[in-house]
């Protein structure tokens, strides 16, 4: 499955929008910094086939979309930027969804892929718990915004590598 050219443009737009969403200086939130343990090994693109990589990318974008679709998120960010960001993620989900279905049809997720999907889910669990513990404070959201920028960059790079493989 070839992801459309608009998909990579959408990735870039999402990152730009997320950068624009920053409301407070990252430096004023240094005390709130946290290591969420991003599962880099799931995004290095070496250990699995394209089909599996797309499933993991889908999980990553889906969890990001869910995180920024909550009521707490709506209260934290400027509404029009948040809506545009969510729209970009939604389009990416549609592209990836079509690819997952096209690549393998609807079938059981390969065993190796299962642990990758769980690793992504656990990563977002850690982010969710952090926000809960920090009572969704502005600094907590700023730390999470910076973290998601980093994780989306990894996703974008993996997608570039997948296109080069084609």
């Amino acid at each position: 499955c070839d992801l459309p050219q608009t998909h990579s443009l959408g990735n870039r737009r999402a990152l730009i929008l997320l950068a624009q969403m920053g409301r407070i200086s990252h430096f004023s939130c240094l005390k709130d910094r946290h290591d969420f343990g991003f599962p880099e090994e799931e995004f290095d693109g070496h250990q699995f086939q394209k089909t599996q990589a797309i499933s993991v990318l889908h999980e990553m974008i889906q969890q990001t979309f869910n995180l920024f679709s909550t009521e707490d998120s709506s209260a934290a960010w400027e509404q029009s930027l948040l809506e545009k960001f969510s729209t970009e993620l939604y389009q990416q989900l549609n592209d990836l969804e079509a690819c997952v279905i096209q690549e393998v049809g609807v079938e059981e997720t390969p065993l190796m892929n299962v642990d990758s999907i769980l690793a992504v889910r656990k990563y977002f669990q850690r982010i969710t718990l952090y926000l809960t513990e920090k009572k969704y404070s502005p600094c907590a959201w700023e730390v999470v915004r910076a973290e998601i920028m980093r994780s989306l960059s990894f996703s974008t790079n993996l997608q570039k590598r997948l296109r080069r493989k084609d």
Partner: antibody, heavy 119, light 108 residues
């Protein structure tokens, strides 16, 4: 509000198959994995597997792998769990439960569907 | 597969008393992925505590959770009549996800 409504009770003969449905409402259906958990009479809970309604991929518990099939219909926001080669030990209440994160993990359950396997 | 063993199987106490329910894992479970559910007859399970120690929405403060590694505990500080039910611990730290066999909390 989030609601999961399951199909009604079923009585099946050994060797037959059963298909239980779970209709979701109150949230975006394709955003969350849906799980199936069963409970035999007087017994504990057993996780059977999960399906991503967005693309239909599944993850099954090895104990059920050869007999279970989970599917979804996005047009009706419904997931299905089909169990084949039924035996008396499969007599149980089958629940669907929505995934999520933090306080949303298995926070929403269907009302349960009793499947009785008897000759 | 991570086996979760709950003890005791049945706990007989009176309203007002303190209840301590244990959940022991066959191998280490990260506390972020250990949950507790309450189930009453004829009903679906209800989320009580998530990530070992966090109270789910609408759950009274008399419920609390603690533990790490392989040993986890659910405590009810002062039992109310509506607390008598079956309690399950659950992990989603690794596939397949598993539940304990349950502890039945009954009125003495």
């Amino acid at each position: 509000q989030v609601q999961l409504v399951q199909s009604g009770a079923e009585v099946k003969k050994p060797g037959a198959s059963v298909k239980v449905s779970c209709k979701a409402s109150g949230y975006t259906f394709t955003n969350y994995w849906m799980h199936w958990v069963r409970q035999a009479p007087g017994q504990g809970l057993e996780w059977m597997g999960e399906i991503n309604p967005s693309h239909g991929r599944t993850i099954y518990n090895e104990n059920f792998k050869s007999r279970v099939t989970m599917t979804r219909d996005t047009s009706t926001s419904t997931v299905y769990m089909e169990l084949s080669s039924l035996r008396s030990e499969d007599t149980a209440v089958y629940y669907c439960a929505r995934g999520g994160l933090g306080p949303a993990w298995f926070a929403y359950w269907g009302q349960g569907t009793l499947v009785t396997v008897s000759s | 597969e991570i086996v979760l063993t709950q003890s005791p199987a049945t706990l007989s106490l009176s309203p007002g008393e303190r209840a301590t329910l244990s959940c022991s894992a066959g191998s280490s479970v990260d506390s972020s992925y250990l949950y507790w559910y309450q189930q009453k007859p004829g009903q679906a399970p209800r989320l009580l505590i998530y990530s070992t120690s966090n109270l789910a929405s609408g759950i009274p403060a008399r419920f609390s959770g603690s533990g790490s590694g392989t040993d986890f505990t659910l405590t009810i500080s002062s039992l109310e009549p509506e607390d008598f039910a079956v309690y399950y611990c659950h992990q989603w730290s690794s596939y397949p996800f598993t539940f304990g066999q349950g502890t039945k909390l009954e009125i003495k």
